[in-house]
């Protein structure tokens, strides 16, 4: 008989936890130093040895007396049936094609877990098993009583299983949903008796690879590669997981100490592709996700250091900085960013090698900037580095507007009282700090003769007594690097308030809306005048320049309010920077109706007549222009008299209205009373808006006819 | 018969550490879930920890989480509570029970009493 | 955390009288709500499991209902030896929470 080359010595061995026969023998026939290609027929039955359920051919390669090791994992729980194990070999070697024949079987190996449960009345399994959603699972009860009837239930539902044996119940859970973070609840009881058994099958959320996997350089010595791990399990108790680093080309693995990202040593033997593979890996499954990349396609330089802004000037700055080499013959593109009041207003590109260098020019003086730099690889371009950002002041520079001039000229006792005022440079015409503000007075009657002033900022105006001169002012703004242009003004002896017809103007939402007719002679501008609190002895005098073929402008103030009336003088500015008054407007941004009514004094009081008569009151202090006057005349007639019309009063009486629309008249005769009889009179002013407020009504009674004989 | 007693109650200032244990038997120790309840004196019942059958899923109360650590002997059929850096508020009685269903209560030891005071 | 809130706090009650205890808890608990029974002195007990399922060895008398987060314990006719404080529980959602009690008196 040929020889046999069976399989001996079989021994297996179980693992609960993972559901796993573990099977181990060798084949002892062999001679020495020999090796054979062999294939293992190895059969599993489950309860009675007829009935096989798993039939597996397993190939490998045998040396003599060398342990084979073998594993299955079986869907049903070890625990809930009895399983047996055999096994016959065969040489599937060419060197030996006489040999290609089946071995004997070993004897059935047998592996009943259930004698060893212990002697409770039920048990459940598996035990704490753990699973990916959507799997497919088995469990089982194993009962040591026949007589009672068991139930058993998945999260409360009743299941529906298939009996294995008298003592054996097997259900068939299909695509397992993840229901909480500490598992899903089975569990069977007896019908009879104190017992309950239940078990938790931990069901995780699908493992998911790994994403946005992705390796960088900043130095070309170490890669640092980064990834975002999938979802976590959904389990209070999570599961560990590895995640693994493998390079084709090098052969290295290394195993990352972190869950996102890991680093890479570069080969210093300039190695320049990588292929790299991720692996992430749980108690349930591996993920792989794979990248190959040029490493000098990966720079990330690091941000530029040493940046200094150098020789800032009024208008000019430099900015230098060094970059960090990222090898012998690249090339860095670095982006400069120039930053004024939070805006960027300037951008560059500029190419280094080692040492960036860019000029900043047309700024503005005395100005914050902030001025950043970044870099990239020029050859191939991955990613900005950081910005390194450097904060500078441009120089001052002298001032570049005249201030803007305007004067008060008032006659007190045979003097000029000029008040000068000036407005405060913007922040782009004062080009640093105003210190101090220059005023010099030029006699132009003594042309020689000159008087400095000097006013120290913040201050806007100054007050000057000058005789009966004419005078030419001349105003500049001075910082630490030199003088404005000068700003001229003329007073001549005649104060030029000559009377001018006062126009009325309606303001609207926009402002005032005024208008001037043209100038014959030269003028070499004209000023809009008014106060923004009128009636406040500090007024707030407020100007407007405007240039000589200008006729119109809109006036407009925040500081306008409803029912204040605005006076607005119009001058024109003669070529000798003299200013004389061209017009006069008045208004109101918003009218509003009367705030009060005028004293009504009564005279002339007859049979059939009397005479009312009211004081003129300031027109200045009324929130809106008066129109006309309202009369009210209460009496007992059922009819109105001629010349009035009935009217509803506020609470609703009946009365009579006289309408008196001349603003101007300031006496009114009511006619045709009748003797002997009550009447009751009222006053009020009305504007555009409406009438005053409703005041008390005034009691006469008109004599009998007869009463004077 | 299904039988649960604990011990290790006693006295301890705060600050001060205790290892409570539960001795089971009357049943398979190893197939079932454990938990600690502890109920201080004239109140309510609190779930404090639980164990897995095998060990390896452990959860505790939020209170307790960081200075109590529940385990477990299969072999010696024994549940343990160690509670470090005990507080006033952590004097009740400590209760072992079997756990057939998650979270569900099913058999009580009859409970040692920690008094936690300086 | 789950708050599990009990009504009554105490009740008394005659011997035979049909006795009824509400627990809302504070959000869905997919029935997994569990009733104890303590009486002065005692070990608690398990009376109810998964909202309605009996525990062995507990009368007939004692059931449960409810689904979602409003669930009833009652008692169809009290006896002298049920004078206790009840719990209920949630077992679906950690931390697991208790109710915190409703005694429960024989006049």
């Known amino acids: 008989e040929p020889l046999s080359l069976a399989p001996e010595s079989l021994e297996v061995s179980i693992d609960s936890a993972r559901q796993c026969l573990h099977l181990k023998w060798s084949v002892h026939n062999l001679a020495y130093h020999q090796e054979l290609k062999m294939v293992f027929q190895i059969e599993i039955s489950r309860i009675k040895t007829s009935n096989v359920i798993w039939v597996e051919n397993y190939s490998t390669t045998v040396k003599r007396n060398q342990v084979l090791r073998w594993s299955w994992e079986s869907k049903l729980p070890l625990e809930c049936a009895k399983h047996s194990v055999r096994m016959r070999g065969a040489v599937d070697d060419a060197q030996v094609p006489e040999l290609r024949f089946w071995s004997n079987w070993t004897s059935w190996e047998e592996v009943d877990v259930q004698s060893s449960l212990g002697h409770d009345p039920l048990f459940v399994f598996p035990k704490d098993k753990l699973v990916e959603e959507g799997s497919n699972v088995t469990i089982c009860y194993v009962s040591r009583s026949h007589q009672n009837n068991i139930s058993c239930y998945l999260e409360g539902v009743r299941m529906h299983g298939e009996q294995l044996d008298p003592n054996v119940c097997v259900f068939h859970l299909k695509n397992v949903p993840f229901i909480r973070e500490t598992g899903t609840n089975i569990y069977c009881k007896a019908d009879q008796g104190d017992v309950i058994k239940g078990i938790v099958l931990f069901v995780s959320k699908v493992f998911e690879e790994p994403k946005d996997f992705s390796c960088e350089t900043r130095d070309l010595k170490t890669l640092n590669c980064t990834w975002a791990p999938g979802s976590d399990a959904g389990l209070l108790t999570q599961l560990s997981q590895s995640y693994t680093l493998f390079e084709s080309f090098s052969g290295k693995k290394t195993l990352c100490k972190y869950k996102s990202w890991c680093n890479w040593q570069v080969s210093p033997d300039s190695q320049e592709m990588y292929n790299f593979t991720l692996t992430a890996e749980n108690y349930l499954r591996k993920r792989s996700v794979h990248l190959l990349f040029n490493l000098t396609h990966r720079v990330h330089p690091m941000a530029p250091f040493n940046v200094f802004v150098k020789n800032v000037s009024a208008t000019n700055a430099t900015m230098t900085w060094k970059v960090h080499s990222i090898g012998n013959y690249s090339t860095l593109l670095c982006q400069i960013e120039l930053y004024g009041e939070g805006k960027v207003i300037q951008k560059q590109n500029v190419s280094v090698k080692v040492n960036g260098k860019h000029l900043m020019k047309k700024l503005e003086p005395s100005t914050e900037y902030a001025a950043q730099v970044r870099c990239a690889n020029a050859n191939h371009f991955w990613k900005w580095s950081e910005w390194t950002r450097r904060n500078f002041t441009t120089a001052e520079a002298a001032p570049s507007e005249a201030p803007d001039v305007w004067r008060n000229v008032k006659s007190v006792q045979g003097h000029c009282v000029v008040t000068l005022f000036w407005k405060p440079l913007s922040k782009l015409q004062a080009n640093g700090k105003i210190l101090f503000y220059n005023v010099v007075l030029e006699n132009l009657d003594r042309p020689s003769t000159l008087k400095l002033l000097s006013i120290p900022a913040p201050a806007n105006g100054t007050e000057l007594t000058l005789d009966r001169c004419s005078y030419q002012i001349h105003v500049t703004a001075n910082n630490s690097v030199g003088t404005s242009p000068a700003s001229v003004i003329a007073v001549s002896g005649d104060p030029g308030n000559k009377e001018v017809e006062e126009e009325r103007v309606k303001g609207t939402e926009d402002g005032f809306c005024l208008s001037w007719k043209p100038q014959p002679g030269d003028v070499t501008g004209y000023v809009v005048e008014w106060c923004e609190r009128p009636g406040d002895p500090l007024c707030d005098l407020q100007w407007k320049n405007l240039g000589p073929n200008t006729t119109s402008t809109v006036v407009s103030s925040d500081a306008f309010r409803p029912g204040v009336r605005y006076n607005f003088r119009i001058y024109g500015i003669s070529t000798e920077r003299i200013p004389y008054l061209l017009e006069k407007k008045t208004g109101y941004s918003q009218e509003l109706v009367p705030s009060d009514n005028p004293q009504v004094l009564m005279s002339n009081l007859t049979s059939y007549s009397f005479t009312l008569s009211w004081k003129d009151y300031a027109a200045e202090s009324q929130p809106g222009f008066v129109q006309g006057y309202s009369l009210y005349l209460k009496s007992k007639a059922a009819r109105c008299l001629p010349g009035s019309e009935k009217a509803v009063l506020s609470d609703d009486s009946i009365c009579c209205k006289y309408k008196i629309d001349n603003p101007k008249q300031k006496t009114f005769v009511v006619e045709n009373l009748q003797p002997a009889s009550f009447y009751e009179f009222f006053l009020t002013p009305y504007t555009s808006v409406g009438e005053g407020p409703q005041g008390a009504f005034t009691k006469v009674t008109t004599p009998d006819e007869y009463s004077h004989i | 018969d299904v039988q649960l007693v604990e011990s290790g109650g006693d006295l301890v200032k705060p600050g001060g550490s205790l290892r409570l244990t539960c001795v089971a038997s009357?049943?398979?120790?190893?197939?079932?879930?454990m938990s600690w309840v502890r109920q201080a004196p004239g109140k309510g019942l609190q779930w404090v920890a639980y164990?897995?059958?095998?060990?390896?899923?452990?959860y505790y109360a939020d209170t307790v989480k960081g200075r109590f650590t529940i385990s477990r002997d299969n072999a010696k059929n024994t549940l343990y509570l160690q509670m470090n850096s005990l507080k006033t508020e952590d004097t009740a009685t400590y209760y072992c029970?079997?756990?057939?269903?998650?979270?569900?209560?099913?058999?009580w030891g009859q409970g040692t009493l920690v008094t936690v005071s300086s | 955390e789950i708050q599990m809130t009990q009504s009554p706090s105490s009740l008394s009650a005659s011997p035979g009288d049909r006795v009824t205890i509400t627990c809302r808890a504070s959000?869905?608990?997919?029935?997994?709500l569990n009733w104890y029974q303590q009486k002065p002195g005692k070990v608690p007990k398990l009376l109810i499991y998964y909202t309605s399922t009996l525990h062995s060895g507990v009368p007939s008398r004692f059931s449960g209902s409810g689904s979602g987060t409003d669930f009833t314990l009652t008692i169809s006719s009290l006896e002298p030896e049920d004078a206790a404080t009840y719990y209920c529980q949630q077992g679906n959602t950690l931390p697991w929470t208790f109710g915190q009690g409703t005694k429960v008196e024989i006049k």
């Open positions: 029970v079997r756990d057939p269903i998650t979270g569900t209560f099913a058999y």
């Open positions: 009357g049943f398979t120790y190893s197939s079932y879930a």
């Open positions: 959000q869905d608990i997919n029935n997994y």
């Open positions: 164990i897995s059958s095998g060990g390896d899923y452990i």
